[in-house]
């Protein structure tokens, strides 16, 4: 297993609709054809997997149908979008990249993107 540098923004504020997008960029040492991207969430010292996708270079990322993540790839960059976020989902979202094929296997883990999520203010009651 060889180490690889992964860069991602330090802080992102999700939209009022609970959507956060960020780029995860990796320094590929070789010509990988198969890449796996995993998003991990760290909050209060606990790490959980948010979503994961394996893709062939030049093709779209395919997450599971019920995944809250979508993404596109361009060269050594992956543009990740996480939706359905609420204030309680605020936390550090870490991008993990694995170059699966061809060998050698490379692994890179970013420092994480702190995603702040603000629940929208409830609309004031109105009389009809």
């Amino acid at each position: 297993c060889k180490a690889m540098h992964v860069a991602q923004p330090a802080v992102v504020l999700a939209s009022s609709r609970g959507i956060a997008s960020f780029v995860c960029e990796y320094a590929s040492p070789g010509k990988a054809t198969e890449v796996r991207v995993t998003v991990l969430r760290q909050a209060d010292s606990q790490v959980t997997e948010v979503c994961a996708a394996t893709y062939m270079m030049g093709n779209e990322l395919t997450f599971l149908d019920d995944s809250i993540c979508t993404g596109t790839s361009s060269g050594n960059q992956v543009n990740l979008t996480i939706q359905g976020l609420r204030a309680m989902d605020t936390g550090l979202y870490i991008c993990k990249v694995e170059l699966m094929y061809p060998p050698p296997y490379y692994l890179g883990i970013g420092n994480g993107t702190q995603i702040y999520v603000i629940d929208p203010e409830p609309c004031p009651d109105s009389d009809f």
Partner: antibody, heavy 117, light 108 residues
Framework: QVQLVQSGAEVKKPGASVKVSCKAS????????ISWVRQAPGQGLEWMGW????????NYAQKLQGRVTMTTDTSTNTAYMELRSLRSDDTAVYYC??????????WGQGTLVTVSS | EIVLTQSPGTLSLSPGERATLSCRAS???????LAWYQQKPGQAPRLLIY???SRATGIPDRFSGSGSGTDFTLTISRLEPEDFAVYYC?????????FGQGTKVEIK
């Protein structure tokens, strides 16, 4: 080193607007956020809101909603805070601060805004 | 809105003494999102502690933070002359982000 430098002091009349700038250096501007905090004379710190320089999304304190606008210019690594319909109780030192994963650091040197007729 | 209440309002101590500052939240705050700042007259605030207990870069080890839930503490083990200032706690786990009203540490 990481530094935030703010624009100079302003004197404004009630009802006017003020726009304070905060120029960042020493780090990747779009990787972080910028928060704005004010401090009235002899008082404590009041959080006004913040902007994510990465995507331009903003979160404002409710009491200032509708009067405040925070923006960034990523070509010059500068954040701006505009406050409209100024009142005498808006007289304060206005600070910008870099928002990290779980901290505000560093802070700008502060900009004194005086609202007086 | 989470209200942070700091106590005491003023702490009168001599250099070399231990200072214990309290910050109590009206609702539970994730310790990841609790910070302490120091402010001297005419200066901008300076980050001391983030994540409730992690010292910021360049902050001497006489400053320490602890606590969880609704009760947080900043301790200065031995006061130096330059430590006399106003200290603020802040939470940024729940919007709106809020500050405590401050504790002034003054020379006795």
């Amino acid at each position: 080193q990481v530094q935030l430098v703010q624009s100079g002091a302003e004197v404004k009349k009630p009802g006017a607007s003020v726009k304070v700038s905060c120029k960042a250096s020493g780090y990747t501007f779009t990787s972080y956020g910028i928060s704005w905090v004010r401090q009235a004379p002899g008082q404590g710190l009041e959080w006004m809101g913040w902007i994510s320089a990465y995507n331009g999304n903003t979160n404002y304190a409710q009491k200032l909603q509708g009067r405040v606008t925070m923006t960034t210019d990523t070509s010059t690594n500068t954040a701006y805070m505009e406050l409209r319909s100024l009142r005498s109780d808006d007289t304060a030192v206005y600070y910008c601060a870099r928002v990290g994963a779980n901290w505000f650091d560093p802070w700008g040197q502060g900009t004194l805004v005086t609202v007086s007729s | 809105e989470i209200v942070l209440t700091q106590s005491p309002g003023t702490l009168s101590l001599s250099p070399g003494e231990r200072a214990t500052l309290s910050c109590r939240a009206s609702q539970s705050v994730s310790s990841s999102y609790l910070a302490w700042y120091q402010q001297k007259p005419g200066q901008a605030p300076r980050l001391l502690i983030y994540g409730a207990s992690s010292r910021a870069t360049g902050i001497p080890d006489r400053f320490s933070g602890s606590g969880s839930g609704t009760d947080f503490t900043l301790t200065i083990s031995r006061l130096e002359p330059e430590d006399f200032a106003v200290y603020y706690c802040q939470q940024y786990g729940s919007s709106p982000w809020t500050f405590g009203q401050g504790t002034k540490v003054e020379i006795k």
